[in-house]
Interface confidence: low
């Protein structure tokens, strides 16, 4: 059958783990994904696949501040196909393809759910440390943390309340630590969200699990 053009091309990306998804399921044809590098060369990925997703993490982590272009080519199974690096042709013609929206990892990757590494209520201070989670971005063979990638552009929002109250307060920091003034002898429950200050959309992560200071732990299981 004649290959159908892919549609609903969508980037699914969290902490730079990045997959391009699309529809429909192919019949009698396959897909090949191409992604442009910084030299604007097209690189073939997920060559001749019947899947409707392609993991492009290895490509996009090379430079998370680059706006990547990608396309999904629909390739007939029965025709002779020649793929040589940058070229993919069927009898001298490029197969039908659909462009994905541009993907700029620094701006577009979702932030994963943060983890509260430690917390302590010490008199009138509630001290909270958020784990600096690893990303899939590498530098000199080492995976970088969120903080190493985003620097001071990464912040955290803490939302907290007295254990027995419904009224909430928030605080923002651009480090991984909070020190909040609280009432002595009163227990507090809180959760944190990561945020990227420079973003227009997609700015906040999901909230962490809610945790409470000592006296309230038993009530929350």
């Amino acid at each position: 059958g004649i290959p159908e053009k892919a549609f609903n091309l969508t980037w699914i990306s969290t902490d730079f783990k990045t997959i391009l998804e699309w529809q429909p399921k192919p019949t009698n044809y396959t897909y090949t994904v191409q992604i442009s590098d910084r030299s604007r060369n097209w690189k073939n990925k997920c060559f001749s696949t019947t899947d409707t997703e392609c993991d492009l993490t290895d490509e996009i982590v090379k430079d998370v501040t680059w706006a990547y272009e990608a396309k999904v080519l629909s390739v007939p199974r029965r025709n002779s196909v020649h793929g040589d690096g940058d070229q993919l042709v069927i009898h001298g013609e490029e197969p039908p393809f659909t462009n994905a929206p541009k993907f700029l990892p620094y701006r577009d990757t979702n932030l994963g759910q943060p983890v509260i590494q430690q917390f302590e209520q010490n008199g009138r201070k509630l001290n909270v440390v958020v784990k600096d989670s690893l990303t899939l971005v590498r530098k000199n063979g080492t995976f970088l943390t969120l903080r190493q990638v985003f620097g001071k552009d990464l912040g955290y929002i803490i939302t907290y309340r007295k254990g027995s109250s419904t009224g909430k307060k928030t605080n923002i920091t651009n480090t991984n630590e909070f020190s909040i003034d609280v009432e002595e002898g009163v227990s507090y429950c809180f959760f944190v969200q990561a945020m990227i200050f420079s973003r227009k959309t997609n700015q906040n992560s999901p909230g962490s699990s809610t945790v409470c200071t000592e006296q309230w732990k038993s009530f929350l299981g």
Partner: antibody, heavy 116, light 107 residues
Framework: QVQLVQSGAEVKKPGESLKISCKGS???????IGWVRQMPGKGLEWMGW????????RYSPSFQGQVTISADKSISTAYLQWSSLKASDTAMYYC??????????WGQGTLVTVSS | DIELTQPPSVSVAPGQTARISCSGD??????VSWYQQKPGQAPVLVIY???NRPSGIPERFSGSNSGNTATLTISGTQAEDEADYYC?????????FGGGTKLTVLG
């Protein structure tokens, strides 16, 4: 207070090389530094940026291959250099702390005059 | 890549409201910042992320951005606001400035 201090004005001949500097007075390595050109009587043009922590750079296509941006994080200084100046390089050059479309603190500018 | 277009000049009487536009394809989906530059001086950031004012910038400066147009609004314009104003945004790994608008405060 964030401060960027640029090197002084330069007068050069066509074909000469030049390196101008921008010294930061804050946590230099964890911020991007951008460079912006302003030709006489004209508007602002983004040239490129550097992340001094690992010297990663990005250039505007208009300036790629025309200039080199570098940094020495040990002395909190970024540089903009030319290997062979042209008369059309005559302009005011600004460095600024940079964050993707946002230049929040600017140096005082370095005037470069190229004339035979 | 996006191109930003500004009017070359805008005039306003002291105390009146000045509006400087910056247009570009689908600009509302990008963050826009605004810079003020007085003669012989370096630019100064006056609005960032569409409508945020850095500390030290007077409240009379405000910004908006939707559709294809971002606008810098100066309420109760003062003589000292006479300057060139530039909009800027970030697209496809490139920073883009508008061509600039000369604001003249009459009188």
């Amino acid at each position: 207070q964030v401060q960027l201090v640029q090197s002084g004005a330069e007068v050069k001949k066509p074909g000469e090389s030049l390196k101008i500097s921008c010294k930061g007075s804050y946590s230099f390595t964890s911020n991007w530094i951008g460079w912006v050109r302003q030709m006489p009587g004209k508007g602002l043009e983004w040239m490129g940026w550097i992340y001094p922590s690992d010297s990663m750079t990005r250039y505007s296509p208009s300036f790629q291959g025309q200039v080199t941006i570098s940094a020495d994080k040990s002395i909190s200084t970024a540089y903009l250099q030319w290997s062979s100046l042209k008369a059309s390089d005559t302009a005011m050059y600004y460095c600024a702390r940079y964050l993707f479309g946002l230049f929040d603190n600017w140096g005082q500018g370095t005037l470069v005059t190229v004339s035979s | 890549d996006i191109e930003l277009t500004q009017p070359p000049s805008v005039s306003v009487a002291p105390g009146q409201t000045a509006r400087i536009s910056c247009s570009g394809d689908n600009l509302g989906s990008y963050y826009v910042s605004w810079y003020q530059q007085k003669p012989g001086q370096a630019p100064v950031l006056v609005i960032y992320n569409d409508n945020n004012r850095p500390s030290g910038i007077p409240e009379r400066f405000s910004g908006s951005n939707s559709g294809n147009t971002a606008t810098l609004t100066i309420s109760g314009t003062q003589a000292e606001d006479e300057a060139d104003y530039y909009c800027a945004t970030y697209d496809s790994s490139t920073d883009v400035f508008g061509g600039g608008t000369k604001l003249t405060v009459l009188g």
